[in-house]
């Protein structure tokens, strides 16, 4: 049933008004990943801290088993940053037969899983070649955008190589979503 | 006291409703930094333009002395981009005894200061090794996420090296926050 | 006319309340670009998918001819990611007389056009030197911030080199805005 707002000369009909503090929201932070069996043909998913430090879930937005559960249909802003770190990549070695090498790379994907739909949907992808010479390297990939999500949708963050994720600080690697 | 929305067959109780245009918001833009005394063991904080050009503060969100002041408790989306530029970094020099060098790096931190709490809290960090060979370099670090902040909290942006911040254009380096 | 919220002992006046689901919003995704005549002294603008896949426009936010049209004055969060890919850049070749070369670069600009104002306004810029050795390269530039926009303003995304934009997947290159 539509809520109403009254004005002298006309009547505007809206969806029910609701307080902003009542909307589903979550900010998850990095934890050290434990080795797990990854699904074939899919980048491994990160698991997250959901209540300690800066992390929280509220207003029916729940975190379970690597997934954020969407409790209510609507438009959500979804974001993540993953900081990667590694040793010297080898992509700049001498090229055979003059051909450029396939570079090393790091990738983050925010994925939506809908139980009624067989294939996950990639919402956001950040992918970067890594070609560092003579040193260790570290760098973040940041993603964020708005999506129309349905009640029951599940969101996860997948990465190309879990062993390169910097898990040391909650401000370096994180994942969040909020209903607009 | 709770605000109420009336519907024919039931009554929903919410926190008081409020117009979105009434919420604390700020977008600050870069200005050239002047040499200052930095706090020991903390990256230096940037100061910002808060009213000229694209910059603004509104609805009791104030800027003073490098800090954004949070006027009301709630969940805020906080973001910043810092564009760095420098001359050739030295991290790719010949390595001694086959060991990788510690690379040059650039770092941005969005920090929360709570007067009643002795230590600042790092909300967001973007950190990147810089290993450029034979050229000038420039690149942005972008950060953004949602945090539960309290009235009286103060936010600032700290950087690893103030002298490498690109101060030339308001669209390259900026800092903002808004109540959700 | 101002909407009112009544409380027992005082009266607070707000701008009219409105349901969040009724606000202008858009998320546009990459399509393959067709060669066009670019404006002199301005980076070329990308055109976008606005209804297929993850893309949508709603609540009077329309997309037409490379522009997002702002249907209502207010504060908007505006974001974009562009993923670039290319072959080896030449910026790290042997330097003449020991001087650093001017590096290759990639740039994304989110631009506002106001019909009553002769010059476009650059809202956001992400610019990055590209200096990769011996391989293909790819990397994203992400931008996002809040701006006060006026009804009738138009937003576009300009890039330094259209031919380097990765148009293969809707999750890699995108552009969006929503009224706060």
């Amino acid at each position: 049933l539509k809520g109403q707002e009254f004005a002298p000369s006309h009547q505007q009909v809206y969806a029910p008004l609701r307080a902003d503090g009542d909307k589903p929201r979550a900010h998850l932070t990095v934890v050290r990943q434990t080795p797990t069996q990854h699904l074939k043909n899919q980048f491994p998913a990160l698991h997250w801290e959901h209540e300690l430090g800066l992390a929280f879930t509220k207003n029916r937005m729940n975190y379970t088993n690597k997934f954020l559960l969407i409790p209510e249909s609507g438009d959500y802003f979804v974001y993540s940053q993953v900081t990667f770190r590694g040793m010297t990549s080898e992509c700049s070695e001498i090229r055979q037969a003059g051909r450029p090498n396939k570079p090393d790379s790091i990738t983050v994907v925010i994925t939506k899983v809908t139980d009624s739909y067989p294939e996950p949907t990639q919402l956001l992808m950040g992918t970067k070649s890594v070609c560092e010479v003579g040193s260790n390297w570290f760098q973040p990939i940041y993603l964020g955008a708005m999506f129309s999500l349905q009640e029951g949708d599940k969101l996860m963050v997948n990465v190309s190589d879990i062993s390169l994720v910097d898990y040391t600080k909650e401000d370096k690697t994180f994942f969040g979503a909020f209903l607009l | 006291l709770k605000g109420q929305e009336f519907a024919p067959s039931h009554q929903q109780v919410y926190a008081p409703l409020r117009a979105d245009g009434d919420k604390p918001r700020a977008h600050l833009t870069v200005v050239r930094q002047t040499p200052t005394q930095h706090l020991k063991n903390q990256f230096p904080a940037l100061h910002w333009e808060h009213e000229l050009g694209l910059a603004f503060t509104k609805n009791r969100m104030n800027y003073t002395n490098k800090f954004l002041l949070i006027p009301e408790s709630g969940d805020y989306f906080v973001y910043s981009q810092v564009t760095f530029r420098g001359m050739t970094s030295e991290c790719s020099e010949i390595r001694q005894a086959g060991r990788p060098n510690k690379p040059d790096s650039i770092t941005v931190v969005i920090t929360k200061v709570t007067d009643s709490y002795p230590e600042p809290t790092q909300l967001l960090m973007g950190t990147k090794s810089v290993c450029e060979v034979g050229s000038n370099w420039f690149q942005p670090i972008y950060l953004g996420a949602m945090f539960s902040l309290q009235e009286g909290d103060k936010l600032m942006v700290n950087v690893s090296d103030i002298s490498l911040v690109d101060y030339t254009k308001e669209d390259k380096t900026f800092f903002g926050a808004f109540l959700l | 006319l101002k909407g009112q919220e009544f409380a027992p002992s005082h009266q607070q006046v707000y701008a009219p309340l409105r349901a969040d689901g009724d606000k202008p919003r858009a998320h546009l995704t990459v399509v393959r670009q067709t060669p066009t005549q670019h404006l002199k002294n301005q980076f070329p603008a990308l055109h976008w998918e606005h209804e297929l896949g993850l893309a949508f426009t709603k609540n009077r936010m329309n997309y037409t001819n490379k522009f997002l049209l702002i249907p209502e004055s207010g504060d908007y969060f505006v974001y974009s990611q562009v993923t670039f890919r290319g072959m080896t850049s030449e910026c790290s070749e042997i330097r003449q007389a020991g001087r650093p070369n001017k590096p290759d670069s990639i740039t994304v600009v989110i631009t506002k056009v106001t019909d009553s104002y002769p010059e476009p306004t650059q809202l956001l810029m992400g610019t990055k030197s590209v200096c990769e050795v011996g391989s293909n390269w790819f990397q994203p530039i992400y931008l996002g911030a809040m701006f006060s926009l006026q009804e009738g303003d138009k937003l576009m995304v300009n890039v330094s080199d259209i031919s380097l934009v990765d148009y293969t997947k809707e999750d890699k290159t995108f552009f969006g805005a929503f009224l706060l």
Partner: antibody
């Protein structure tokens, strides 16, 4: 108050070396690049190079490469510029300068006059 | 090296006049252009940074414009203390280079 205070005037013979000091105060010395700029009598400004006081890294203009050495002592917040194999054309006022960014100069020393004469 | 040229090399004007000085770079330097004022016997003082942004504490009668290769310094209403030599300087690439200067004299 941010200040750069330079050493006093010098008179040198051709072929000799000169070392000018620049003591910084009022700001974090290691946080900002220190530049050296010279100005011959009645002439314009000429950038000689910089030192990054934090790392000690330097960047010299090609013209002075091999003749100039920039160093620093962080314990006393002082930068030094040494120019060797002096010739009469090196007669100039030598300024140290720093700024909030590495590419511009907000704060200047008072200048040190170096005269090269036989 | 990037070569900076300035014009005119000198000009005469009166208190209250509007004057402009131009600076040209031999290649694009984006917005990495600074303007300095130097009075006789003194160290230079920065006026404008980033081609168009006024340094804190500098009077608003000074303004800068331009990007790429062509830049302008304008003084809207000359004051007695403005009679000095003005230099542009590029910060895009090392070696940083200055223009040869423009001497502004009282008519």
């Amino acid at each position: 108050e941010v200040q750069l205070v330079q050493s006093g005037a010098e008179v040198k013979k051709p072929g000799a070396s000169v070392k000018v000091s620049c003591k910084a105060s009022g700001y974090t010395f290691t946080g900002y690049y220190m530049h050296w700029v010279r100005q011959a009598p009645g002439q314009g400004l000429e950038w000689m190079g910089w030192i990054n006081p934090k790392s000690g890294g330097t960047n010299y203009a090609q013209k002075f490469q091999g003749r100039v050495t920039m160093t620093r002592d962080t314990s006393i917040s002082t930068a030094y510029m040494e120019l060797s194999r002096l010739i009469s054309d090196d007669t100039a006022v030598y300024y140290c300068a720093t700024g909030g960014s590495f590419d511009a100069f907000d704060v200047w020393g008072q200048g040190t006059m170096v005269t090269v004469s036989s | 090296d990037i070569v900076m040229t300035q014009s005119p090399s000198s000009l005469s004007a009166s208190v209250g006049d509007r004057v402009t000085i131009t600076c040209r770079a031999s290649q694009s330097i984006s917005s990495y252009l600074n303007w300095y004022q130097q009075s006789p016997g003194k160290a230079p003082k920065i006026l404008i940074y980033g081609a168009s942004r006024l340094q804190s504490g500098v009077p608003s009668r000074f303004s800068g414009s331009g990007s790429g290769t062509d830049f302008t310094l304008a003084i809207s209403s000359l004051q007695p203390e403005d009679f000095a030599t003005y230099y542009c300087q590029q910060g895009d690439n090392t070696p940083f280079t200055f223009g040869p200067g423009t001497k502004l004299e009282i008519k």
